[in-house]
């Protein structure tokens, strides 16, 4: 007995589509082997029509596809524009057509219901608008026009030109009679309901001279579009509901087990807490279309999603909807990375951001998720080097470690930095990820002075204390600019054995600027790293002033005043929106941090690493 299972019988009507789901045991071999849909011929051979390897027969070109969902042990064969010639016996299977793992499916395509001669067929999705055209002769121009719905043997009046409107169609139907010379009237029905489905009769005049025209209205619930995304990745639902609802509140909801639809997000400010920090409803275009981005996908995000429009911001019968079935693939190509990163006030965090390794040249970005209204994500930093002004000196995006991961470092942390941040690129949008920064109790591990004033032409020495736990790490000083943090040349630090016996409470690595020049003014970072993986950093601002007294200046390691709080984000910052997601260069322009000039270079700047005998304080 074959372990493949599906529908034994599928019946449909001409012009329709079918979506045949075949289930298989999701073993490793089954998940990755070829899937096929073939038609059994008189000879007993089964001729492939479509397969998971991309083959589509000429008979199916442009109207069929096969999608494998390995995670679920399911593959789906979609066939559109059915004709009666498609009736027959088929097999869905795994591997080779002639062997083993397959299931027999009988497909029957019928002509559909017999309709009166000359019946016009209107096929419209639920919630949309239909315009039924009703021709008439000149002699019936002055006479009553009406639309009836046929229910069984009776005809029920829906609307007429004497201002009658059936209560079932109240506020969503209108009859239009054109000016003289045009021998056609139209009936427009908005916000179609499933119950509107059926046969209608247009009538102009009465008695034996009346004009009649039949209309068959087919109201369909939209077939959900299959969406298959990776765990930890991102999905975008593009929702185009039409101009009729351009000014109506929009929503995305998820169908629950009670067959109702729970709002995930809407334009009235409602948002499901399960999506906090990882959802944006992008502003709608003039045509009323909008999109919803969800990042950090979880297995429990799977399900059927509907987007729609209604003044209440939630699903109501008879309003337009679009549907998706989201599957989340646990065999994800997106690597695991921490979803929560913790830092202490005054300290730092180094966030690893994954990107599609095939797109190493893509521009990298980091933005701050803001929950107000529909959510937005103003860009804070990008790989081209632009940094939001209020993050000057404390934020940097590094291409390291590379090969599918970049690093974002944020230091001088305050409680206001707690929140959700998104990693993204201008390439593969499915690789957007979310990280939450939490500020916890504690002291920074690296200790540097507060703000430092250096004297032009003299020597400046800045100490950076680190605890013993960092003794095996590489230490560095770098000069921050809006294009990154340029590592400063270090002096020979002596043999690494110096760090093996770590008895002292802390050690220090010093930065020496000799002589100090105007170009040395700016932010300097002391940091630790292991290979291409960055650890903690501490920042110090060096101001340069004219010479007042002679001699070298040594800055004591005592903690100086913290830098003042950053400015609040202004409303003009760029943010992710529909177009910009595809190409973040389309964001509105904004003020950027001016480049801080030449990097300190040559032998003027040096880094010295030694023990700090004179410093007795301990560091957590």
């Amino acid at each position: 007995k074959s372990p493949v299972f599906g529908p034994q019988e599928v019946s449909s009507v001409e012009g329709n589509s079918v979506s045949i789901k075949c289930y298989y045991p999701p073993t490793s071999v089954n998940r990755h082997t070829r899937k096929y849909w073939c038609r059994k011929g008189a000879s007993g051979r089964c001729i492939t029509l479509v397969s998971s390897e991309g083959y589509v027969s000429s008979n199916y070109a442009g109207r069929a596809n096969l999608t494998n969902f390995p995670e679920n042990g399911t593959f789906v064969v979609n066939i559109a524009q059915l004709s009666r010639d498609d009736s027959g016996h088929y097999k869905c299977g795994l591997g080779i057509n002639s062997r083993g793992l397959s299931f027999d499916v009988s497909l029957e395509v019928s002509q559909g219901p017999e309709l009166p001669n000359g019946t016009e067929v209107y096929t419209v999705d639920v919630g949309r608008t239909v315009t039924i055209k009703c021709p008439f002769k000149t002699e019936n121009a002055p006479k009553t026009k009406a639309l009836y719905k046929k229910i069984g043997q009776t005809s029920v009046l829906v609307i007429d030109s004497r201002n009658y409107v059936n209560p079932n169609y109240k506020d969503r139907i209108r009859l239009r009679i054109p000016g003289t010379g045009q021998l056609i009237f139209t009936v427009v029905i908005d916000r179609l309901r499933l119950s509107d489905h059926g046969l209608y009769l247009c009538q102009a005049g009465d008695g034996s001279n009346r004009d009649e025209k039949n209309a068959d209205l087919q109201v369909l619930e939209p077939e959900p579009e299959l969406v298959y995304e990776d765990l930890r990745g991102s999905v975008t639902f593009h929702c185009a509901l039409g101009l009729e609802v351009a000014n109506v509140a929009k929503f995305l909801c998820r169908v629950n087990s009670r067959e109702t639809c729970d709002v995930v997000i809407n334009t009235l400010g409602k948002r499901d807490s399960a999506f906090e920090g990882r959802i944006l409803l992008n502003p709608q275009d003039k045509d009323g279309s909008f999109s919803v981005v969800i990042t950090g996908l979880r297995k429990e995000d799977e399900g059927r999603y509907l987007c729609g429009a209604h003044s209440d911001g939630q699903l109501q019968e008879g309003w337009p909807i679009q549907a998706w079935q989201l599957f989340v693939n646990e065999e994800s190509t997106i690597p695991r990375s921490p979803t929560v990163v913790k830092g202490v006030a005054g300290g730092s965090v180094a966030v690893l951001c994954p990107y599609n390794p095939k797109e190493s040249q893509s521009l990298k970005y980091w933005c701050l998720w803001e929950g107000a209204q529909n959510g937005r994500c103003p860009l804070l930093v990008e790989s081209q080097g632009l940094v939001q002004e209020q993050y000057e000196g404390r934020l940097s995006l590094l291409q390291e470690p590379g090969n599918g991961t970049f690093t974002v470092i944020l230091n001088q942390l305050t409680t206001q930095d707690a929140g959700f941040y998104w990693c993204l690129t201008n390439g593969d949008t499915r690789w957007r990820t979310t990280v939450e920064i939490k500020i916890i109790e504690g002291e920074p591990n690296l200790k540097v002075p507060g703000n430092v004033t250096a004297v032009l032409g003299e020597t400046l020495n800045i100490p950076c204390h680190f605890p013993c736990k960092f003794s095996s790490y590489e230490k560095y000083w770098c000069k921050w600019s809006n294009t990154g943090c340029q590592t400063l040349p270090s002096q020979d630090e002596g043999p690494s054995e110096a760090f093996v016996n770590c008895d002292e409470n802390s050690r220090l690595v010093s930065l020496t600027l000799n002589p100090v020049t105007r170009a040395d003014e700016g932010w300097y970072w002391c940091g630790v790293k292991q290979g291409h993986f960055y650890g903690e950093t501490a920042a110090v601002y060096v101001a340069v002033e004219e010479k007042k007294v002679a001699g070298s200046r040594y800055v004591s390691p005592a903690k100086a005043d913290a830098a003042p709080d950053e400015k609040v984000l202004d409303s003009g910052v760029r943010e992710i929106e529909n177009k910009a997601i595809q190409d973040p260069r389309l964001f509105a322009e904004e003020k950027v941090v001016a480049d801080t000039g030449d990097q300190a270079g040559g032998s003027r700047a040096s880094v010295d690493s030694s023990s700090s005998e004179e410093q007795g304080g301990s560091s957590k």
Partner: nanobody, 126 residues
Framework: EVQLVESGGGLVQSGGSLRLSCAAS????????VGWFRQAPGKEREFVTA??????????YYADSVKGRFTISRDNARNTVDLQMNSLKPEDSAVYYC?????????????????WGQGTLVTVSS
Amino acid sequence: EVQLVESGGGLVQSGGSLRLSCAASGRTFDQFTVGWFRQAPGKEREFVTAIRWSGSTTYRYYADSVKGRFTISRDNARNTVDLQMNSLKPEDSAVYYCAGQMSQWSDPRGDDYDSWGQGTLVTVSS
């Protein structure tokens, strides 16, 4: 929420026929799945058949043990799903349950149905 009520169970001789009905009340859908399951005393519940519809397309699923003997159908006017059981055997004796689900994707043989009926007893005597 959809409520489901089974009817039509009873005692029948081996080789005989029986027609079970599953009536749905509450909201009805253009896309829905109704499955029939059965549970004999001391045994696990097992899948019998299911019907899934989407607009004017219908998909019918049968367990190997009932294929060719049982037929599942949908009566739009009465809002019911009927199970015609022919050539009944003593091993078909069980409590028959109907179940409904919104999902168009999950395996109809599975147990992730959203609503279940109370069941109707079918006894086939030899």
